[in-house]
């Protein structure tokens, strides 16, 4: 019993004054707690607790289930205990069959004895099976049998507590050991989509999948740079032993522009942590942004091909696309496709294939695209480069020689005089007048140039060459004339096209 020193509170005293008491089943348990500041008796066995506010605890007919620790507590919080065994040959064990063991830790098989004097208190495998060779245990009649350093391989091991009573082995009810694995790697986390683009008012929902060996992995959705607790819903499954999956779904039922940001799914266990992020962008309305992949002013040679290519961002999805030229819509020759097959893709490509372009097919080609919120367009100005064509070459009544040529880019007209029968006209002649004429054709068509020289300057027989040229090629026309005395003969023009 505790010694009393004046001025210092002491623990209560219990009668009978033993640490352990053995009574037979059916006998009376009578425990007296003496203390001026008595508060209560507490009884504990396995996970059950009972309280009694009387200072004398009386159980008239003791049962095996009255086996346990009886503790008396005073107002100073000091206590004293006695352990009572209620010996019942028909019930040697009290059991709590819940048996969970943490890998690499010790775990208690809770089968305390009702009789401390039985022998060979130990563990046995079910149906006569041997226990794993490396399984070590320590018996304690008041608590049960402690399995040392639980291994993952012991999972679902079937066990009995066992004692020898009068030379016979007696087994408890069976226990199934469930091993909780130790974390030996960080959780595996993944997210349903890496980025989300929404319009205001739409629902944002994103799922994080957490995989680990056990359900005691911790996980949460966090908003970066914010402490606000997010509303999330969990689904989870054990796909098998040591194969646990949780799906944490974060939902914002009506997203606002200021909900935009980075959301992190964070998971950790005792080994370490892992996280994955997703980005939410909320826009007040949809949009389309078009990016030409080639210059919007295009020069192409006559008879060649050109592809007009645009990339565009469209959110929500594009609904109508078309290519237009001269108020006519192309029904073929173009294709439109997403830039990637990714579910969150908002980038698309549209290509118009123009083949063997003629000089008359220059002009403005327009790409139009729309979605449920907006329309957008982009125009390409296509110029077809053509070799000059000499439209007219005449001697005018006023004695002028006139050459009119068309082509793109704008042709330059040079004049040459070839005296006599020479084939090479080298002496250049300066024009009297050069004009660029307005073409009657469509814009972006050929440009027409008119150039004139004064034939009176020529005093000898010969040929005059009108040469029209640009970046694409050149074309010539010739005027032949001869002198009879002082009179010029009729001039005979002819053309010679040079490649």
């Amino acid at each position: 019993q505790p010694s009393v020193s004046p001025g210092e509170p002491s623990p209560p005293s219990i009668h009978p004054g033993k640490s352990d008491l053995i009574v037979r089943v059916g006998d009376e348990i009578r425990l007296l707690c003496t203390d001026p500041g008595f508060v209560k008796w507490t009884f504990e066995i396995l996970d059950e607790t009972n309280e009694n506010k009387q200072n004398e605890w009386i159980t008239e007919k003791a049962e095996a289930t009255n086996t346990g620790k009886y503790t008396c507590t005073n107002k100073h919080g000091l206590s004293n205990s006695i352990y009572v065994f209620v010996r019942d040959p028909a019930k040697l064990f009290l059991v709590d069959r819940s048996l969970y063991g943490k890998e690499d830790n010790d775990t208690l098989v809770r089968c305390p004895l009702t009789d401390p004097e039985v022998t060979n208190y130990s563990l046995k495998g079910c149906q006569g099976k041997p226990l794993p060779k490396d399984l070590r245990f320590i018996p304690d009649p008041k608590a049960g049998i402690m399995i040392k350093s639980v291994k993952r391989a012991y999972h679902r091991l079937c066990l009995h507590c066992s004692v020898d009573q009068e030379g016979k082995s007696v087994l408890s009810e069976k226990f199934i050991l469930k091993v909780r694995p130790a974390f030996k790697a960080v959780p595996v986390v993944s997210v349903s989509k890496a980025s989300y683009l929404l319009r205001e008012g739409e629902e944002f929902t994103v799922t994080c999948t957490i995989k680990d060996v056990s359900s005691s992995v911790y996980s949460t959705w966090k908003r970066e740079n914010s402490q606000t607790k997010l509303q999330e819903k969990y689904n989870s499954w054990h796909h098998g032993d040591f194969n646990y999956e949780r799906q944490a779904t974060l939902t914002i039922s009506s997203a606002r522009v200021n909900d935009s940001g980075v959301f992190m799914c964070y998971a950790n266990n005792t080994f370490g942590s892992a996280n994955v992020t997703t980005t939410l962008e909320v826009v007040d309305k949809g949009f389309i942004n078009i990016f030409p992949m080639i210059n919007t002013t295009v020069f192409v040679n006559d008879g060649e091909n050109v592809d007009l290519i645009v990339e565009y961002e469209a959110f929500p999805k594009p609904e109508h696309q078309q290519w237009i030229y001269m108020n006519r819509t192309f029904t073929d020759k173009w294709e439109d496709y997403p830039k990637s097959e990714n579910e969150s893709n908002i980038r698309y490509v549209s290509e118009l294939h123009l083949t063997r372009l003629k000089g008359t097919e220059g002009g403005t080609y327009t790409f139009l695209v729309s979605n449920s919120d907006v329309n957008a367009a982009i125009a390409f100005n296509v110029y077809v480069n053509t070799k000059p064509e000499i439209l007219t070459y005449d001697r005018l009544v006023n004695g002028m020689l006139q050459c009119v040529a068309a082509g793109f880019p704008e042709p330059t007209i040079d004049w040459y005089f070839c005296p006599g029968t020479e084939q090479r006209c080298s002496a250049s002649v300066l024009p009297v007048d050069v004009q660029t004429l307005n073409s009657s054709g469509p814009p972006f068509g050929k440009l027409v140039v008119q150039s004139s020289i004064d034939s009176s300057a020529f005093k000898h027989n010969g040929t005059v060459e009108c040469k029209a040229y640009n970046d694409v090629g050149k074309t010539s026309a010739y005027f032949n004339f001869a002198f009879k005395g002082n009179n010029k003969e009729q001039i005979h023009p002819h053309t010679l096209f040079t490649p």
Epitope: S216, N235, H238
Partner: antibody, heavy 123, light 107 residues
């Protein structure tokens, strides 16, 4: 002995809220998850959600998300279930149940049940 | 969510009969299954946990078997006090779900 004692029957108006309590005794309160299950008249059992008394973590069935709140008071070993925006189909007996023989709310089973609380939603 | 399908929904039997109730999960749930008995006006009572472990105090005529997706509750010799409704429940993952129930009536 281990037991769960629930609060008495309630009659509530449409759109109102109800808060049912469940007082645990005879065991270590913080060691066991506590679930709520309801049963409409003549119907089967429907799991509503769970609270971990040791830390107060919760998980709810999707159906009740946003309408149900589960709390606990460790000083009185009591858990509470509050259901808001009551509808006529919420008329049911509500049970609290201890998750025994299990681990972190899985496996095992509900080994101890409260006696049930009848909640009637009237117009 | 994991769906639990119980069959039959009701059955009639006599005292002494052997009764079998089955429960099927929509996906594998290991042996994370419980069986409950409920009598009118009363709270459910746990009979079997972990698919086959008999709860303390439950008569040995009740037994459970199965793992993965198919489970069975067997009452080896039906007693008058066994006429009740029986429910299975999966405890493998959230949300936890119950079977629809099997009502055992007197023939």
């Amino acid at each position: 002995q281990v037991q769960l004692v629930q609060s008495g029957a309630e009659v509530k108006k449409l759109g109102a809220s109800v808060k049912v309590s469940c007082k645990a005794s005879g065991y270590t309160f913080s060691s066991y998850y506590m679930h709520w299950v309801r049963q409409a008249p003549g119907q089967g059992l429907e799991w509503m959600g769970v609270i971990n008394p040791n830390g107060a973590g919760t998980n709810f069935a999707q159906k009740f998300q946003g309408r149900v709140t589960m709390t606990r008071d460790t000083s009185t070993s009591t858990v509470y279930m509050e259901l808001s925006s009551l509808r006529s189909e919420d008329t049911a007996v509500y049970y609290c149940a201890r998750h025994g023989r299990g681990y972190e709310g899985y496996e095992g089973a509900f080994d101890i049940w409260g006696q049930g609380t009848l909640v009637t939603v009237s117009s | 969510d994991i769906q639990m399908t119980q069959s039959p929904s009701s059955l009639s039997a006599s005292v002494g009969d052997r009764v079998t109730i089955t429960c099927r999960a929509s996906q594998g749930i290991r042996n994370d299954l419980g069986w409950y008995q409920q009598k009118p006006g009363k709270a459910p009572k746990l009979l079997i946990y972990d698919a086959s472990s008999l709860e303390s105090g439950v008569p040995s005529r009740f037994s459970g078997s199965g793992s993965g997706t198919d489970f069975t509750l067997t009452i080896s010799s039906l007693q008058p006090e066994d006429f009740a409704t029986y429910y299975c429940q999966q405890l493998n993952g959230y949300p936890l779900t119950f079977g629809g129930g099997t009502k055992v009536e007197i023939k």
